[in-house]
């Protein structure tokens, strides 16, 4: 296993609709054809997997149908979008990139993007 540098923004504010997008960029030492991207969430010292996708270079990322993540790739960049976020989902989202094929296997883990999520203010009751 060889190490690889992964860069991501330090902090992002999700939209009022609970959507957060950020780029995860990796310094590929070689010409990988198969890449796996995993998003991990760290909160209160617990790390959980949010979503993961394996893709062939030049193809779209395919997450599971029920995944809250979508993404696109361009060269050594992956543009990740996480949706359905609520205030309680605020936390550190870490991008993990694995170059699966061809060998050698490379692993890179970013420092994480702190995503802040603000629940929208409830609309005041109105009489019609």
């Amino acid at each position: 296993c060889k190490a690889m540098h992964v860069a991501q923004p330090a902090v992002v504010l999700a939209s009022s609709r609970g959507i957060a997008s950020f780029v995860c960029e990796y310094a590929s030492p070689g010409k990988a054809t198969e890449v796996r991207v995993t998003v991990l969430r760290q909160a209160d010292s617990q790390v959980t997997e949010v979503c993961a996708a394996t893709y062939m270079m030049g193809n779209e990322l395919t997450f599971l149908d029920d995944s809250i993540c979508t993404g696109t790739s361009s060269g050594n960049q992956v543009n990740l979008t996480i949706q359905g976020l609520r205030a309680m989902d605020t936390g550190l989202y870490i991008c993990k990139v694995e170059l699966m094929y061809p060998p050698p296997y490379y692993l890179g883990i970013g420092n994480g993007t702190q995503i802040y999520v603000i629940d929208p203010e409830p609309c005041p009751d109105s009489d019609f």
Partner: antibody
Framework: QVQLVQSGAEVKKPGASVRVSCKAS????????ISWVRQAPGQGLEWMGW????????NYAQKLQGRVTMTTDTSTSTAYMELRSLRSDDTAVYYC?????????WGQGTTVTVSS | EIVLTQSPGTLSLSPGERATLSCRAS???????LAWYQQKPGQAPRLLIY???SRATGIPDRFSGSGSGTDFTLTISRLEPEDFAVYYC?????????FGQGTKLEIK
Amino acid sequence: QVQLVQSGAEVKKPGASVRVSCKASGYTFTSYGISWVRQAPGQGLEWMGWISAYNGNTNYAQKLQGRVTMTTDTSTSTAYMELRSLRSDDTAVYYCARFIYGMDVWGQGTTVTVSS
Amino acid sequence: EIVLTQSPGTLSLSPGERATLSCRASQSVFSSYLAWYQQKPGQAPRLLIYGASSRATGIPDRFSGSGSGTDFTLTISRLEPEDFAVYYCQQYGTSPYTFGQGTKLEIK
């Protein structure tokens, strides 16, 4: 070194608007947020809101909603805070600060005086 | 909104003594997203502690933070002359990101 430099003092009449700038250097501007905090003479700190320089999304204090606008110009690594319909109780020192976990780097402050 | 109440309002101590400052929240602070700042007259605030207990870069180890939920504490183990200032707590877990009213630490 990491630095935030704010624009100079302003004197405004009630009802006018003010725009304070905050120029960042020494770090990747789009990787962080910029918070705005004000402090009236002899008073404590009041959080006004923040903007994610990465995507331009904003979160404002409800009491200022509709009067405040925070923006960024990523080409010059500068954040702006505009406050409209100024009142005498808006007289304060306005600070910008880099935000991630709390506010770790602060500007020097901009004094805004609202007086007729 | 979360109201942060700091106590005492003023604390009079001598250099070398231990200072304990309290910050109480009206409801639980999400993930202990609580910061402490120091402010001296005519200066911008300075971040001391974030995440309730993590020291910011360049902050001496005589400053420590603790607590979770609704009760948080800033401790200065041995006061230096330059520590006399106003201290603010702030929660940044739930919008709006409110500040406490401050504790003034003065020389006895």
